[in-house]
């Protein structure tokens, strides 16, 4: 990718997914009735015409929002602190790296629209998640539903990153 998002960024993303999986505290089978349609903006991560700025912006905003969501008093009360600390550290590292990349991509003249538009969409999506948690009084099941939702959206975003990486490889080898 622009600053050549290295292999270790993909590794960090997968590590975040592993941590989110390990954070599970109750059986999701107990929480079926708490499911909610958060309307993850799939169109943002499914396109075939992927711009570097767009991909980085989506990843950056996703990680920033996940960091914020899991960096609250409510979150600290809900999750294992050791795993939560590891999650914070991993997200912080990824965010630092993405910020460096985004500066470089903007310096290369990629459209600012490709950066601001996904950010706004994702903020709305995460706001819906926050409203849901409040509505459900931050219950164990509500957090479990949110944990699964974040895993799904992060998985889709990481896939988008992998697609761009393989597109770059194809261009490089042709």
């Amino acid at each position: 990718l622009g600053c050549d998002l290295p292999q270790n960024h993909g590794l960090l993303s997968r590590n975040t997914l592993v941590l989110l999986h390990q954070m599970r505290r109750i059986s999701p089978f107990l929480c079926l009735k708490d499911r909610r349609d958060f309307r993850f903006p799939q169109e943002m991560v499914k396109g075939s015409q992927l711009q570097k700025a767009h991909v980085m912006s989506v990843l950056h905003e996703m990680l920033q929002q996940i960091f914020s969501l899991f960096h609250t008093e409510r979150s600290s009360a809900a999750w294992n602190m050791t795993l939560l600390d590891q999650l914070h550290t991993g997200l912080h590292q990824q965010l630092q790296h993405l910020e460096t990349c985004l500066l470089q991509v903007v310096g290369e003249g990629e459209s600012a629209g490709a950066i601001s538009s996904p950010a706004l969409t994702l903020r709305r999506y995460f706001q819906g998640i926050r409203v849901y948690l409040k509505e459900k009084k931050y219950s164990d099941c509500a957090w479990e539903v949110v944990r699964m939702e974040i895993m799904k959206s992060l998985f889709l975003s990481t896939n988008m990153q992998e697609r761009l990486r393989s597109k770059d490889r194809d261009l490089g080898s042709s």
Epitope: R24, S27, P28, L32, K33, R35, E144, M148, F155
Partner: antibody, heavy 121, light 107 residues
Framework: EVQLVQSGAEVKKPGESLKISCKGS????????IGWVRQMPGKGLEWMGI????????RYSPSFQGQVTISADKSISTAYLQWSSLKASDTAMYYC??????????????WGQGTLVTVSS | DIQMTQSPSSLSASVGDRVTITCRAS??????LNWYQQKPGKAPKLLIY???SLQSGVPSRFSGSGSGTDFTLTISSLQPEDFATYYC?????????FGQGTKVEIK
């Protein structure tokens, strides 16, 4: 293309053991739960139980608790349904189907083709 | 356990007819209700999920409605390939339960 492929038909005697399988492909196997459904000859659908292949957490219908065991091997994207001692009343078609777990997506959107189990002396 | 009761248990209809099948839950299940179609010797096929969402690839003549305890599956204009058995199923809570089925036969 998402597929759930089940093992072939089985003919067994009462008291014998059996393990049938359901192999998932074309999707992230650990992102969905796998449910098992029984259909006795000429009858309706009965939910038996469900497994989360990511960590093998399992829940059974009270009617099937202790009668069958559901398991999964995520390394080969396969779920299993097994009996330690079959009865004639276990004669039925058994289906596996995938479930999105807590994610907002269609329930049981893909089904295996079914495994016919016949138990007769 | 949540009991699911379908009615009628069978019905005879002609091609082009409007067909309605109802499903009642023994307690409120919000909109966690799915409808399946099953043809002899085949696996069930998902038609409607979350009470009213049409599954991808399913013809628009199928529709679902309802919430709470009372639900309906409607086939607006019955086609020859629609003669089958239809099941409702709740996924509001475990154990997951199915209705007993409604067989739609040719008049």
């Amino acid at each position: 293309e998402v597929q759930l492929v089940q093992s072939g038909a089985e003919v067994k005697k009462p008291g014998e053991s059996l393990k049938i399988s359901c192999k998932g492909s074309g999707y992230s196997f650990t992102s969905y739960w796998i449910g098992w459904v029984r259909q006795m000859p000429g009858k309706g659908l009965e939910w038996m139980g469900i497994i989360d292949p990511s960590d093998s957490d399992t829940r059974y219908s009270p009617s099937f608790q202790g009668q069958v065991t559901i398991s999964a091997d995520k390394s080969i994207s396969t779920a299993y349904l097994q009996w330690s001692s079959l009865k004639a009343s276990d004669t039925a078609m058994y289906y596996c189907a995938r479930h999105p777990g807590l994610n907002w997506a269609p329930d049981f959107d893909y089904w295996g083709q079914g495994t016919l189990v016949t138990v007769s002396s | 356990d949540i009991q699911m009761t379908q009615s009628p248990s069978s019905l005879s209809a002609s091609v082009g007819d409007r067909v309605t099948i109802t499903c009642r839950a023994s307690q409120s299940i919000s909109s966690f209700l799915n409808w399946y179609q099953q043809k002899p010797g085949k696996a069930p096929k998902l038609l409607i999920y979350y009470a009213s969402s049409l599954q991808s690839g399913v013809p628009s003549r199928f529709s679902g409605s309802g919430s709470g305890t009372d639900f309906t599956l409607t086939i607006s204009s019955l086609q020859p390939e629609d003669f089958a058995t239809y099941y409702c199923q709740q996924s509001y809570d475990l154990p997951i339960t199915f209705g007993q089925g409604t067989k739609v036969e040719i008049k």
